[in-house]
């Protein structure tokens, strides 16, 4: 649960200011650009040559509580004839994202950032071939 | 900057507890799973049939300060011969992510969550064809 190097300075007050009480910060309520949404996908996940399914994970002590993970449907990619081509690869595209974890002990509630690895979709890749001797 | 419906209950204390001072919460220092990383991409963005480039955006008052955005290289997809096939589409895959925004007025520092739309990569899609009469 350490703070990454970049974060060490990010969470500090300017040097000329009295230092912050160790271990906690002030988080303002509300979310900037809360209404920003990914445009409707027009079924990209079904029409891609590397199609994928979605699984929804739910955790009431996480914000957002609902996180969607993609899984590639095939090992290979779908060709123009709609058949799987195993000489190509469906490969997951992953993204590091932040979520907010809620922690409570009795009536004392605090929050902490958590890094999460999300698979967002899949892409079709032509692998290089190596013969092992 | 309103709190989405789900967030309204997420940020509240249990009903039996004295209510939280309006407008701010306690954020613990440190990031859970800070070391979690997307596995090295092995040049997925170059070998994909819908290849993409990356642009890095930098904001010192955002955590993480560095956010990487993908842009599809072509309108079409790259076929087996390495040529662009304009009858297929390279389509961006987008993801909503949270970042932390730092706000300071003099020595008073506070933080707020911000929603960001990130393009993570591209996928190759067979477009639906409509003939307009």
């Amino acid at each position: 649960q350490r703070v990454p190097k970049e974060g060490q300075t990010f969470f500090q007050k300017p040097e000329s200011c009295p230092s912050v009480p160790e271990g906690s910060l002030k988080l303002d309520l509300g979310i900037i650009n809360a209404n920003q949404r990914v445009p409707l996908s027009r079924n990209i996940e079904r029409r891609s040559t590397s199609p994928w399914n979605y699984t929804v994970t739910w955790d009431p002590n996480r914000y957002p509580s609902e996180v969607v993970q993609a899984q590639c449907r095939h090992l290979g990619c779908v060709n123009a004839q709609g058949k799987e081509d195993i000489f190509m690869n469906s490969v997951p595209i992953q993204q590091e994202t932040l979520v907010l974890r809620r922690k409570h002990q009795g009536c004392s509630v605090s929050f902490q950032l958590e890094k999460l690895l999300v698979t967002v979709g899949c892409t079709c890749v032509k692998p290089l071939i190596h013969h092992v001797h | 900057q309103r709190v989405p419906k789900e967030g309204q209950t997420f940020f509240q204390k249990p009903e039996s507890c004295p209510s939280v001072p309006e407008g701010s919460l306690k954020l613990d220092l440190g990031i859970i799973n800070a070391n979690q990383r997307v596995p090295l991409s092995r040049n997925i963005e170059r070998r994909s049939t819908s290849p993409w480039n990356y642009t890095v955006t930098w904001d010192p008052n955002r955590y993480p300060s560095e956010v990487v955005q993908a842009q599809c290289r072509h309108l079409g997809c790259v076929n087996a011969q390495g040529k662009e096939d304009i009858f297929m589409n390279s389509v961006p895959i987008q993801q909503e992510t949270l970042v932390l925004r730092r706000k300071h007025q003099g020595c008073s520092v506070s933080f707020q969550l911000e929603k960001l739309l990130v393009t993570v990569g591209c996928t190759c899609v067979k477009p639906l064809i409509h003939h307009v009469h």
């Epitope: 090992l75 490969v91 692998p127 | -």
Partner: nanobody
């Protein structure tokens, strides 16, 4: 560099079973999937079975569905192909394939012969 060691090939009678194993070593990290192809003289290599590393999702060629089972051991970086109810048409050189998304490694192959 990646090494693949295949084992378990041999000669059997129709209806018998064989188990092929493949172990990966070297820089075999970030595995996408692991599997087997086969080839008979004068024919293209054909996919037999594959298993995705992240979630153990499996795929099989129609010709082996219900007879062959692929499994993996994440800790040891190994994949096994259990081949039951073997037929003479399963005779081929079986190649282990390790897929790292943008690079695919092919083993040297192990001969499987099924006589009637």
């Amino acid at each position: 560099e990646v090494q693949l060691v295949e084992s378990g090939g041999g000669s059997v009678q129709a209806g018998d079973s064989l188990r092929l194993s493949c172990a990966a070593s070297g820089r075999a990290n970030s595995i996408n999937w692991f599997g087997w192809f086969r080839q008979t003289p004068g024919k293209e290599r054909e996919f037999v079975a594959g298993i995705r590393w992240s979630d153990a999702y499996t795929e099989y060629a129609n010709s082996v569905k219900g007879r062959f089972t692929i499994s993996r051991d994440n800790a040891k970086n190994t994949v096994d192909l259990q081949m039951d109810s073997l037929k003479p048409e399963d005779t081929a050189v079986y190649y282990c394939v390790l897929d790292l998304s943008t690079v695919r490694y092919w083993g040297q192959g192990t001969q499987v012969t099924v006589s009637s």
